[in-house]
Amino acid sequence: VPRWRQQWSGPGTTKRFPETVLARCVKYTEIHPEMRHVDCQSVWDAFKGAFISKHPCNITEEDYQPLMKLGTQTVPCNKILLWSRIKDLAHQFTQVQRDMFTLEDTLLGYLADDLTWCGEFNTSKINYQSCPDWRKDCSNNPVSVFWKTVSRRFAEAACDVVHVMLNGSRSKIFDKNSTFGSVEVHNLQPEKVQTLEAWVIHGGREDSRDLCQDPTIKELESIISKRNIQFSCKNIYRPDKFLQCVKNPEDSSCTSEI
C-alpha cells in the first residue's frame, strides 16, 4: 500500500540532489586550495542531517549549525558583493573581478545555488515530488532557512564598504521582502561597515533616468542610515559595458559614465 505523502505547493527536491551536492563540494575544494581540507562526505552528511526525517515546515537555523561549522571559510570582509533579483550579473561580475565574493562564491553558497530540497517527518526519504513553498505553505522550510542562515552570516562578515547590486528593471528595485531586504540589510554590523553602496542596474538601452532617486532606494537609504551606516548609490546604465570595463579598465571608453 503506497504511503500517504504530503503534497506541497512548491517543486520537489532537485533530481540527483545528493550526487549534485557531493560533486559540487568535490569540484569546489579542488578549485579552491584553501578548502582542500574539507571532507565532502562529512559536508553531505551534515547537509542531509539538517532536513532528513524532519518536518519540512519546522526547520530551524540550529539544524544547519553542523553544516555551517564544516563550511567555515573566511571571506575578505571588504570584498563582499550582495545582490537582489539580479544574480546572473552579480556572478558574472565576480567571475571577472576575482577578488570580490558573492555568497554563491563561497563553498556553502555554491553547494546550494539553484537547488531545492526537503525531506519528510519520521522517514529518511528525500521528497522529490514537492517541497513547501515559502508563501503558500510555510517559511521555515529547508531551503528558506538555509539561505536565511548563510545570508545572515555572510552579511555579518562584511566590513568597510559593502556593495549591493539591485535590479533597476523591477517595480520594487529594493524589496523589503527579499533576502537582501529582510535578512542581509539587518545583519550588516554598523561597527564594522562604514558604507553600503548600491549599484542599480538599468535594463533598457535608452533608460537614462536616475534610479537612485527611486522611492524604494530612498527607503533603503533610510533603513541603512538609521543603522548608522552611510549609503551611496550609483546607476549602472550599461551593464554590458560595465562588465567589459571591469575586464579591461584601461579601455579609453571606460572613463565615461557606464
Epitope: 584553501e34 581540507h37 563550511g71 567555515t72 573566511t74 555572510f154 555579518e156 562578515a157 564594522k192
Partner: antibody, heavy 122, light 107 residues
C-alpha cells in the same frame, strides 16, 4: 563564567614531547574555534594556528607545521597542543584562546587560558 | 601572510598624558583589526575589536580608529595600570597575525 584552564608548566629535555591541555567551560565549546599562541621569553605573541572544534580540523601557521599537533577531546570540552621532538627554541609560554566562528569570519580572541610555560633544557 | 607593523616599539610617557599607538597592515584589511593589552606575566586581554568597537569592562579611555591599512589605539590620559605591552591582531585572513607590540613605559 567563561574559563579556559590550561595544564601546568613542564621542564623537558630536547627530543622529548609535551602535551598541553586547555579545558573550556562556561560556553558551548563547538561555537568557538580554539587558537594557540606562542610567546618566547621577552618576545611578542606568535600565532600558531587553530582547530575547528566541531570538525576537529586543524590549521597551522607556516612556522608550526610538522612537530606541532592540535587535537580535541570534544566530550571533555578540551583542546590539546602536542609538541614532539622538542628543541631549545620551543621554550616559551603557550596560550590557548577562543574565537567565535561566524562561518565566514572570525571574531577576535576574547578569552584566553592562563598560559603554560614549557622549558626545554638539557 | 598579512604583516602588521606596530610603532613605536617603545613609548615613554608620564601618567596623565594621552598617547596614540600605530598599527599598519601590509594590505587593506577593512576593519578586521583587534587590540590587546598584555601585562607582565599575564595573558593578553582584548581591548578593542574591529578597529573601533569597545569591549564591555574596558575603561572608556581606550579607543580605536582606522580602516584599510592604518589603525590607531588611543589612550586618553594614561593611568599607572596602563603601562604594559599592546598588540594588534588581524582576522581578515584565516591565517591570523599579530603585530610585534608596543611597550608603554613610564617616563
Amino acid at each position: 563564567q567563561i574559563q579556559l584552564v590550561q595544564s601546568g608548566p613542564g621542564l623537558k629535555k630536547p627530543g622529548e614531547s609535551v602535551k598541553i591541555s586547555c579545558k573550556a567551560s562556561g560556553y558551548t565549546f563547538t561555537d568557538y574555534s580554539m587558537h594557540w599562541v606562542k610567546q618566547a621569553p621577552g618576545k611578542g605573541l606568535q600565532w600558531m594556528g587553530w582547530i575547528n572544534t566541531y570538525s576537529g580540523k586543524p590549521t597551522y601557521a607556516a612556522d608550526f607545521k610538522g612537530r606541532f599537533v592540535f587535537s580535541l577531546e570534544a566530550s571533555a570540552s578540551t583542546a590539546n597542543l602536542q609538541i614532539s621532538n622538542l628543541k631549545n627554541e620551543d621554550t616559551a609560554t603557550y596560550f590557548c584562546a577562543r574565537c567565535y566562528d561566524g562561518t565566514f569570519y572570525y571574531d577576535p580572541m576574547d578569552a584566553w587560558g592562563q598560559g603554560t610555560s614549557v622549558t626545554v633544557s638539557s | 601572510n598579512i604583516v602588521l607593523t606596530q610603532s613605536p616599539a617603545t613609548l615613554s610617557v608620564t601618567p596623565g598624558e594621552s598617547v596614540s599607538l600605530s598599527c599598519r597592515a601590509s594590505q587593506s584589511i577593512g576593519t578586521s583589526i583587534h587590540w590587546y593589552q598584555q601585562k607582565s606575566n599575564e595573558s593578553p586581554r582584548l581591548l578593542i575589536r574591529y578597529a573601533s568597537q569597545s569591549i564591555s569592562g574596558i575603561p572608556s579611555r581606550f579607543s580605536g580608529s582606522g580602516s584599510g591599512t592604518d589603525f590607531t589605539l588611543s589612550i586618553n590620559r594614561v593611568e599607572s595600570e596602563d603601562f604594559s605591552i599592546y598588540y594588534c591582531q588581524q582576522s581578515y585572513s584565516s591565517l591570523v597575525t599579530f603585530g610585534s607590540g608596543t611597550k608603554l613605559e613610564i617616563k
